[in-house]
Interface confidence: low
């Protein structure tokens, strides 16, 4: 079952899936000037059995200059200005969750892929949040969101995270000494497509996450 909406938006924070549940789809998007080859897949799909999961299909891009009449089912990156994204960085293979049964690793890059990746998450998917560069998290604890099915509707649980800029920290009483955390992703509470990026998350991320309260929607 696909999740109906995006993981919650947290000001000055970005999320990342450490591993992708079977059933997750990744759009085959090409960078500007390129498009999917005529016979190419629309998306990659995380599939597998109890012992092994992998991405089915392979995304392939070709120059737009080449005659190609394939209908574009999903919008091209330049049409997605409303969806907040961050640029791709080199893919990382987290060692802690990548081997989870029923999960796929971050898919490897393909030639001329778009600078953003658009995932369609499924129920049970977990994503982790970190503050963007220049902001820091207050208080320690988990900062994850899980897509759950409740009363026939999908909902993301609310991460307990607040990120504050260095200049703002004096406004918060009783904070612990947090550690720096990387890169970023902004907004979107309503769409079904999810963009995320492969920013560097250390395997000890969960231990260094420092969190707080504020929710943006009921779960």
């Amino acid at each position: 079952e696909l999740c109906d909406d995006d993981p919650p938006e947290i000001p000055h924070a970005t999320f990342k899936a450490m591993a992708y549940k079977e059933g997750t789809m990744l759009n085959c998007e090409c960078k500007r000037g390129f498009r999917r080859i005529k016979s190419g897949s629309l998306y990659m799909l995380c599939t597998g059995n109890s012992s092994h999961s992998s991405w089915d299909n392979q995304c392939q891009c070709t120059s737009s200059a080449t005659r190609n009449t394939t209908k574009q089912v999903t919008p091209q990156p330049e049409e997605q200005k409303e969806r907040k994204t961050t640029e791709m960085q080199s893919p990382m293979q987290p060692v802690d969750q990548a081997s989870l049964p029923g999960h796929c690793r971050e898919p490897p890059p393909w030639e001329n892929e778009a600078t953003e990746r658009i995932y369609h998450f499924v129920v049970g998917q977990m994503v982790y949040y970190q503050c963007v560069q220049g902001y820091r998290a207050l208080h320690r604890g988990p900062a994850e969101s899980v897509c759950k099915m409740t009363h026939g509707k999908t909902r993301w649980t609310q991460p307990q995270l607040i990120c504050t800029g260095e200049m703002e920290t004096s406004q918060f009483p009783g904070e612990e000494k947090p550690q720096a955390s990387p890169e970023g992703r902004p907004e979107s509470e309503t769409s079904c497509l999810v963009t995320t990026t492969d920013f560097q998350i250390q395997t000890e991320m969960a231990a260094t996450m420092e969190t707080s309260i504020f929710t943006t929607e009921y779960q």
Epitope: E9, P11, H12, L138, H139, G141, T157, Q158, Q160, I162, T164, G165, E168, Q171, F172, P186, E187, S188, E189, T190, T211, S212, I213, F214, T215, T216, E217, Y218, Q219
Partner: antibody
């Protein structure tokens, strides 16, 4: 249906203390951050205090720090606001809200009047 | 603190009118803006979250837009039941802050 019912308000003298309560029902109280927002008569709205779902983390606006204490009892699905050293400027309707910064659901409010 | 300056503070309009209420933040709030409606003697209720997302159960005549420091709430066709005070609120930076409110009345 989500219900938030505030109680504990009334007329109190400056310098005294008061404890407001908010009884929650219709949702899993322990999963949600909660907040108190106040509104002085004929005035705007002001976030006062926040508390995380587990009660471990609390935040206050500068003007109430040290005088206000937000707390919760997840077993009783109840939110509290202890107000000490009451001042005339604390006179307001106090609303209990769910959903942290979004103020997704609100109680009907409880009036606190500080006067000698 | 981030200041949210709402305008106008008072607005009189007729049924069927298109109404816009503006909110200007003292700094970029990155679309982290909610809009609330408060009727006389009632608690506020959220209409719009995240600048332009309509709260479940809110009529589609309400819409929100904006970016950076400037945000707008629009009522496409004013109805009698829309008489209320409207507040914007930012949640980009603690402490979250509200605008001063716009009182909307019928002509």
């Amino acid at each position: 249906e989500v219900q938030l019912v505030e109680s504990g308000g009334g007329l109190v003298q400056p310098g005294r203390s008061m404890k407001l309560s908010c009884a929650a029902s219709g949702f899993t109280f322990s999963n949600h951050a909660m907040a108190w927002v106040r509104q002085a008569p004929k005035k705007g709205l002001e976030w006062v205090a926040y508390i995380s779902y587990d009660g471990d983390n609390t935040y206050y606006r500068d003007s109430v720090k040290g005088r206000f204490t937000i707390s919760r009892d997840n077993a009783k699905s109840t939110l509290y606001l202890q107000i000490d050293s009451l001042r005339s400027e604390d006179t307001a309707t106090y609303y209990c809200t769910t959903g942290g910064n979004s103020g997704y659901d609100w109680g009907q409010g409880v009036m606190v009047t500080v006067s000698s | 603190d981030i200041q949210m300056t709402q305008s106008p503070s008072f607005l009189s309009a007729s049924v069927g009118d298109r109404v816009t209420i503006n909110c200007k933040a003292s700094q970029n709030v990155n679309k982290f803006v909610n809009w609330y409606q408060q009727k006389l003697g009632e608690a506020p209720r959220r209409l719009i979250y995240g600048t332009n997302s309509l709260q479940t159960g809110i009529p589609s005549r309400f819409s929100g837009s904006g970016s950076g420091t400037d945000y707008t709430l629009t009522i496409s066709s004013l109805q009698p039941e829309d008489v209320a005070t409207y507040f914007c609120q930012q949640y980009s930076s603690w402490p979250w802050t509200f605008g001063g409110g716009t009182k909307l009345e019928l002509k």
